[in-house]
């Protein structure tokens, strides 16, 4: 399909789907006129959809097709019939050619469960399409995909729990009508970015839901509220799990993916932060040892401010292949933060910061910044990042994450930005200052922090090394260290990763 | 055993347009993309764009999007490239090439190489 | 487009020598490099993908390494028919793109 790149309107940040003549396939109606013919006049016509059994890591081994009815090739690639079962669906294609996630994938299945049958699920002809049709035609790959499932079943020890979707953009949709229209219900769908575009606001058997296997799980990447959202932003698993906010990806800015702008386009950042919901799963598979932990929270202001890092009653969870089964909750939307590139796991820790008083404040936000120092590393300097305002005499909450162990936390540095970032805020300094012209500068008094990590669930307080100084103003620091009655352990559930 | 076979060597006049095949044997036809490089005189090799037999599926380097049409023959297991408006810019060696699915697979079997000429 | 750069363009060597030629992409293609060979009459060859593995049929002098942005073939114990031009080729993002060739000669 020549010409098929999509035009992304970059400054009204919507993007125009254009792709070139559709193939010679038809609309929904007359293809699934085709795939139900009876089985003698089926033969004329070649399927819309294949399925390459991988035998084998190597991409370049052409694996087996499987076709409904046949059981030679079954036996001919040593289908395992007991064991798990894993059917990669691939989403809208602008190339006609899988795209290099699908490889990744393959080969981190083959390599975390040796014995398992890898499917992938050819559906480029219906794909490789306009977008609109493309989505059309999803119903019809989820009933040719059913179709399969159905006659695998009519084999002895095949079981439909043993049957895990992936599904990709588009493919995660397909996955949803598939477990829809399959006789019975299978052991679990991932939805890896589920499209969002047609998508979006649905009715629940018209996308992805939790109704659509006994395990439903989602990564949402890419998704906006404003502009057009590629990836759905709605939760529609039993878990839907938003790493950094489900939109905005580390290492997918234009600076990060182009390198240099002569390198590429907006186009690139779009599939950077798209994909990383596959690379996210992929790491899931490939580094069990650092697994990921994903925590409940209503929306992701309150994640941001640290308020959401409790394991208690399932709030907390591993993302990607080791999330534990919560067929109990439905739509559970989980947040947690990621470094830019595999292994993603950070290290979560919520801080308390109880302002008891403060002087002058004016109309500007302080910056703060904190270090911390454990037994393992000391971190970096790290951001605390204000999403409301600081309030005086309450408990302000915040969130910081680190790329690394720090072990058993020391102590921890606060400091106090003093040149203002933006000249903004030097305006509203400037217009302070001329309102209130003797004003003694700006001081906050902290006596102590809360830490807790989400990954241990531990809790600690540390006070001020000096029980006599607990002002800081711009432009200073102040040192807390872990106070004396520091070790303080709720009894709170540590997220165990419980592998599948 | 795996092999392409590409046509005879073309001398055309400039306006012209040309139609190249490429025969495969020794494999699926199907199960495999076939994608065509240009080779200037004396220069780099280009990537023009490739065909999924499977389904007709294509995708040019835009570059190329108005020059060459990708078109297969399942029952005979041939693919062809069509150049339309030949200029001398044209005047190249042009190869077909066994591909497998992902981006990433390399073109694993070559054909031998077509030479066009294009001369007033 | 990325830019794949085959600094040598030509390269002069001794039979049973060892040479490396190498190449440059201008982003990170994740180790998505392949390997050609062409000989003089025009037959090209595919040798190493995805930076280190050997094509079936193509001799153990041949290896491929590298990761990120730079990428090496080497060609160790150098014979009679290995005398031909050799182009790296990218394949992570389209449009594929191939480094300018490096030409090896008899010294």
């Known amino acids: 399909m020549s010409n098929s790149v999509p035009l992304l309107c970059f400054w009204s940040l919507c993007y125009c789907f254009a792709a070139g003549s559709p193939v010679p396939f038809g609309p929904e109606g007359r293809l699934e006129d085709k795939l139900h013919k009876p089985k003698a006049t089926q033969t004329e016509v070649k399927p819309s959809v294949r399925f390459n059994l991988r035998t084998s890591k190597d991409p370049e081994h052409e694996g087996c097709y499987l076709s409904v009815g046949h059981s030679q090739p079954l036996e001919d690639c040593s289908f395992n019939m007991t064991a798990k079962t894993f059917f990669i669906i691939h989403g809208w294609t602008m190339s006609g050619i899988f795209e290099n996630w699908l490889h990744k994938l393959v080969s981190a299945l083959h390599t975390r469960e040796k014995d398992a049958n890898v499917v992938v699920v050819d559906w480029l002809p219906l794909a490789h399409q306009l977008y609109t049709d493309a989505v059309n035609n999803t119903r019809v790959v989820g009933h040719s995909i059913a179709r399969m499932l159905d006659w695998l079943q009519e084999k002895d020890d095949f079981s439909l729990g043993n049957v895990h979707l992936i599904g990709y953009s588009l493919g995660a949709h397909v996955a949803g009508y598939a477990g829809n229209f399959v006789k019975g219900t299978v052991g679990r769908i991932t939805g890896l970015d589920p499209a969002g575009p047609m998508f979006e606001g649905a009715d629940i058997h018209k996308r992805l839901s939790p109704d659509d296997a006994d395990f439903v799980d989602v990564l949402h990447t890419y998704t906006r509220s404003f502009g057009l959202s590629i990836g759905i932003q709605m939760p529609v698993g039993h878990i839907d799990i938003y790493p950094n906010g489900g939109d905005f990806q580390p290492g997918c800015g234009l600076n990060d993916v182009l390198g240099s702008i002569a390198y590429g386009t907006i186009t690139e950042v779009v599939k950077c932060e798209h994909e990383r919901a596959v690379h996210l799963f992929v790491d899931s598979l490939v580094n069990q040892d650092k697994p990921s932990f994903a925590f409940q929270c209503t929306d992701s202001n309150r994640f941001k401010k640290g308020i959401c890092l409790s394991c208690r009653k399932n709030r907390c969870n591993s993302i990607g292949y080791n999330a534990k089964k919560m067929r109990n909750k439905r739509n559970s939307k989980m947040y947690l933060k990621t470094r830019a590139g595999m292994p993603f796991r950070v290290y979560h820790y919520q801080m308390k910061i109880h302002v008891f008083s403060y002087k002058n404040m004016g109309e500007i936000e302080p910056t703060f910044y904190v270090t911390l120092y454990g037994t393992n590393a000391d971190s970096q300097t790290l951001p605390l990042e204000i999403v409301e305002r600081i309030e005086q005499n309450a408990t302000n909450t915040f969130l910081v994450y680190t790329e690394e162990d720090l072990g058993d936390l020391l102590k921890i540095q606060l400091t106090w930005e003093g040149a203002s970032q933006s000249w903004y805020n030097l305006w509203k300094e400037f217009r302070s200052y001329l309102s209130q012209p003797r004003n003694p500068g700006r001081e906050l008094n902290i006596r102590r922090i809360r830490v807790k990590s989400g990954e241990t669930q531990r809790k600690l307080t540390f006070c001020t090394e000096d029980p006599e100084n607990t002002s800081i103003s711009p432009g200073r620091e102040l040192w807390f260290r872990k106070c004396r009655d520091g070790w303080r352990m709720k009894n709170e559930t540590s997220p165990t990763v419980e592998l599948p | 055993e795996v092999q392409l076979q590409q046509s005879g060597p073309e001398l055309l006049k400039p306006g012209a347009s040309v139609k190249i095949s490429c025969k495969a044997s020794?494999?699926?036809?199907?199960?495999?993309?076939i994608h065509w490089v240009k080779q200037s005189h004396g220069k780099s090799l280009e990537w023009i764009g490739h065909?999924?037999?499977?389904?007709?599926?294509?995708n040019n380097n835009e570059k190329f999007k108005d020059k060459a049409t990708l078109t297969v023959d399942k029952s005979s297991s041939t693919a062809y490239m069509e150049l339309r408006s030949l200029t001398s810019e044209d005047s190249a060696i042009y190869y077909c090439?066994?591909?497998?699915?992902?981006?990433?697979?390399?073109?694993?079997?070559w054909g031998q190489g077509t030479t066009l000429t294009v001369s007033s | 487009d990325i830019q794949m750069t085959q600094t040598t363009s030509s390269l002069s060597a001794s039979l049973g020598d060892r040479v490396t030629i190498s190449c440059r992409a201008s982003q990170d293609i994740n180790n998505y490099l392949n390997w050609y060979q062409q000989k003089p009459d025009g037959t090209v060859k595919l040798l190493i993908s995805?930076?280190?593995k050997l094509h079936s049929g193509v001799p153990s002098r041949f290896s491929g390494s590298g990761s990120g942005t730079d990428y090496s073939l080497t060609i160790s114990n150098l014979e009679r028919e290995d005398f031909a031009t050799y182009f790296c080729?990218?394949?992570?993002?389209?449009?594929?793109?191939f480094g300018s060739g490096t030409n090896l000669e008899i010294k």
């Open positions: 090439a066994r591909k497998g699915i992902y981006y990433s697979s390399p073109f694993d079997y």
């Open positions: 080729q990218q394949g992570n993002t389209l449009p594929f793109t």
């Open positions: 995805y930076t280190s």
């Open positions: 020794g494999y699926t036809f199907t199960d495999n993309t």
């Open positions: 065909i999924n037999p499977y389904y007709g599926g294509t």
